[in-house]
C-alpha cells in the first residue's frame, strides 16, 4: 500500500555463490553488468587489486560491476569488497568466451544468459529485491480506498509474475473498475476497494529456474452509516470591524450526501427561544456539497446588526450535526484597539 | 495495559460444540488482526484461525476448516471461537493473540482456556 | 510434524551462550519474517523476538535473532536460570494457502 511509484533502475544480477571463486565466460563486445549482493552501499569491486573508478567503460558504480563492450584486456579477477571490514562478498574471474577451452573441469564455469538487450548475467532462480517493503503482509483498508500490493523480484532469465485471489489466478475480469497490473514494478492495483475484494493475494514469480510467492490479507473496512461530523473549531469565533466582509467557514464530512443550512439566531419578543425550546434562527444560505468538502458563508459590508450568533447545521440520512459561532463587530474606531489585542487580532477576518 | 482474557472452554464429547470467547480490553480492537492459537497437552503451538478487523475476512488452518468459525464483535471488543464437530485432537489449550498490525505477528495473548473432548 | 524444524531441547548453563536453530523453505521463512515465543512454564506464550531480529521493549539485550535465506536461529547470550522454557519459531507460510507455522518447539534447561 504505497502512495508512489519509485523509479527503480534495472536490476542487476548478483554472482550466485557468495564468497566462493565463480567463473564467467563472456564473449567479446558484450556489455557486463554485475552486482555485489543485493545492496548498494557500501561495497568496492575490485580487479587485480585495484579498486575500479566509478566512471569509465570498466567501472564499478553503486555496487555494481558495468563494462560497456567486453574487451580482452577485461578478462582477469574481480572482487567484491564490503567497505569496512573488507570481507570478500564476491569472487569473480571473468573469460573471453573463446578461452573456455583453458578452463578445467572442476571449475564448472556457470551458465551465462543474454538479454535482448546483449548485457550478459549468470542464471539466477527469482529472487525478492526488497523484501523490507513486503513486510506488512496485513492490510485493513476503508472501503472506497486504492490498494497497491508489491512483489518486486528479479532473476535470470527475467521472471514472470501472476497473481492470485484465494488460490484462483486473478485478472480482476470480475471486480468493478477491474485491476492495474504494473509488471515493470512488479505492482497489483485495485482502485475503490469494496467488501468482495477481501481475500488472500498471492504473487507468483516463476522462471525457467525456479519461483517464489508471496501472500498478502486484505480486509476492507464497509463504512459504518453516520450523521456528519463537523471539524472541530469551525465556524470560529471572529472579530469584524463594521464595514468589513467576513467568513465563516464549516468544515463537513458525511459519506451520506450532506444538507447544509447557516443559521442566524435572532431574538423575537425579547426572546431567543421559542415555547418548544428551539432557537428562534433565520436561515441565511442552503446549499449541498460533496463529501469533505468546506461550506463558506460570506457576510459583505457588515454593521452592527450582523453581530450575533451563526449555526452550521449539516444534515443527511442518518441525522443531524450542528456547530455554533459568534461575531463581533466593532465599530471602526476601536480598529486600533482590536489589532493591539493578541486575542482579538488572531480572530480579525479583514476582507477589503 | 493490553489484556486478552479466554473463556467458554471446558469438557465436551466428540461431535459437540463450544463457543469460546475472547474479552479484549486497553486497546482499540476494533482496527486489530485477531488470532486463535491452540497448544494440545505436552504439545507445540498450532495456528487456527485469523480474522480481519472487519470481521469480514477470515482465514483457517486445514485441521480445523469447516468446523471452526472465528467471528468478532466489535461493539463488545470480544472475539469467538465457534467450534463444531469436536474431535478427540482438538484438545488443546486454546489462545487468544492479537496480531501486530505492521509485522504481522503475536504480539500479546491471552492465558488461554482448556478444552477437552472425552467420551 | 511442525513445518518449521527445531531441535527438540538445548542446554547450557549459567552465563554460557546457547543457539537454537529453525529450519524451514522458500514459502515460509524464505519470504516471510521470523518470529521468536518464549513459554515458560505453565504461562502463554510471550513475544520473543519479532522480524527475524527485532526485540520488543522488555526482552533483555542477551536475547538476539537472525535470519540467513531459509533457517532462522535464537542466540541466548549470558543464560540465566529463569530463561528455562520453550522457545518456538514462527513465520507465516505462503503456499497454496496463506497460513501461520510454527516449529516444535524448543525445551531449554538451565543447568546447575
Known amino acids: 500500500l504505497e502512495a508512489s511509484e519509485e523509479m527503480e533502475q534495472e536490476p542487476c544480477l548478483a554472482p550466485i555463490l557468495e564468497q566462493q571463486e565463480q567463473v564467467l565466460t563472456v564473449a567479446l563486445g558484450q556489455p557486463v553488468r554485475l552486482c555485489c549482493g543485493r545492496t548498494e552501499r557500501g561495497r568496492h569491486w575490485y580487479k587485480e587489486g585495484s579498486r575500479l573508478a566509478s566512471a569509465g567503460r570498466v567501472r564499478g558504480w553503486r555496487g555494481r560491476l558495468e563494462i560497456a563492450s567486453f574487451l580482452p584486456e577485461d578478462a582477469g579477477r574481480y572482487l567484491c569488497l564490503a567497505r569496512g571490514s573488507m570481507t570478500v562478498v564476491h569472487n569473480l574471474t571473468l573469460l573471453m568466451d573463446d578461452s573456455l577451452t583453458s578452463i578445467s573441469n572442476d571449475e564448472d564455469p556457470k551458465t551465462l544468459s543474454s538479454s535482448s538487450s546483449g548485457h550478459v548475467y549468470p542464471q539466477q532462480a527469482p529472487y525478492w529485491t526488497h523484501p523490507q517493503r513486503m513486510e506488512k503482509k496485513l492490510h485493513a483498508v476503508p472501503a472506497g480506498n486504492t490498494v497497491k500490493f508489491r512483489c518486486p523480484a528479479a532473476g535470470n532469465p527475467m521472471p514472470t509474475i501472476h497473481w492470485l485471489k484465494d488460490g484462483q489466478a486473478f485478472h480482476g475480469e470480475n471486480r468493478i473498475g477491474g485491476i492495474r497490473l504494473r509488471h515493470q514494478h512488479w505492482s497489483l492495483v485495485m482502485e475503490s476497494v469494496v467488501p468482495s475484494d477481501r481475500g488472500t493475494y498471492t504473487c507468483l514469480v516463476e522462471n525457467s529456474l525456479g519461483s517464489i510467492r508471496y501472500s498478502y490479507l486484505l480486509d476492507v473496512l464497509e463504512r459504518s452509516p453516520h450523521r456528519p461530523i463537523l471539524q472541530a473549531g469551525l465556524p470560529a469565533n471572529t472579530t469584524a470591524v463594521v464595514g468589513s466582509d467576513v467568513e465563516l467557514l464549516c468544515k463537513v464530512y458525511s459519506d451520506a450526501q450532506p444538507h447544509i443550512q447557516w443559521l442566524k439566531h435572532v431574538v423575537i419578543n425579547g426572546s431567543s427561544f421559542g415555547a418548544d425550546g428551539f432557537p428562534y434562527v433565520q436561515v441565511l444560505k442552503t446549499t449541498d456539497i460533496n463529501s469533505s468538502e468546506v461550506e463558506v458563508l460570506y457576510l459583505r459590508n457588515v454593521s452592527a446588526e450582523d453581530a450575533g450568533e451563526y449555526t452550521c447545521l449539516a444534515g443527511n440520512s442518518i441525522g443531524l450535526s450542528y456547530q455554533s459561532a459568534w461575531l463581533t463587530v466593532l465599530p471602526e474606531e476601536d480598529l486600533t484597539w482590536t489589532t493591539a489585542t493578541p486575542e482579538a487580532a488572531s480572530h480579525h477576518h479583514h476582507h477589503h | 495495559e493490553v489484556q486478552l482474557l479466554e473463556s467458554g472452554g471446558g469438557l465436551v464429547q466428540p461431535g459437540g460444540s463450544l463457543r469460546l470467547s475472547c474479552a479484549a480490553s486497553?486497546?482499540?480492537?476494533?482496527?486489530?488482526?485477531m488470532a486463535w492459537v491452540r497448544q494440545a497437552p505436552g504439545k507445540g503451538l498450532e495456528w487456527v484461525s485469523v480474522?480481519?478487523?472487519?470481521?469480514?475476512?477470515?482465514v483457517y488452518a486445514d485441521s480445523v476448516k469447516g468446523r471452526f468459525t472465528i467471528s468478532r464483535d466489535n461493539s463488545k471488543n470480544t472475539l469467538y471461537l465457534q467450534m463444531n464437530s469436536l474431535r478427540a485432537e482438538d484438545t488443546a489449550v486454546y489462545y487468544c493473540a492479537r496480531i501486530n498490525s505492521g509485522s504481522s505477528h503475536f504480539d500479546y495473548w491471552g492465558q488461554g482456556t482448556l478444552v477437552t473432548v472425552s467420551s | 510434524q511442525s513445518v518449521l524444524t527445531q531441535p527438540p531441547s538445548a542446554s547450557g548453563t549459567p552465563g554460557q551462550g546457547v543457539t537454537i536453530s529453525c529450519s524451514g523453505s522458500s514459502s515460509n521463512i524464505g519470504s516471510n519474517s521470523v518470529n521468536w515465543y518464549q513459554q515458560l512454564p505453565g504461562a502463554a506464550p510471550k513475544l520473543l523476538i519479532y522480524s527475524n531480529n527485532l526485540r520488543p521493549s522488555g526482552v533483555p539485550a542477551r536475547f538476539s535473532g537472525s535470519k540467513s535465506g531459509t533457517s532462522a536461529s535464537l542466540a541466548i547470550s549470558g543464560l540465566r536460570s529463569e530463561d528455562e522454557a520453550d522457545y518456538y519459531c514462527?513465520?507465516?507460510?505462503?503456499?497454496?494457502?496463506?497460513?501461520?507455522?510454527f516449529g516444535g518447539g524448543t525445551k531449554l534447561t538451565v543447568l546447575g
Open positions: 486497553g486497546f482499540t480492537f476494533s482496527t486489530y488482526w
Open positions: 514462527a513465520a507465516w507460510d505462503d503456499g497454496l494457502d496463506a497460513y501461520v507455522v
Open positions: 480474522i480481519g478487523p472487519s470481521g469480514g475476512m477470515t
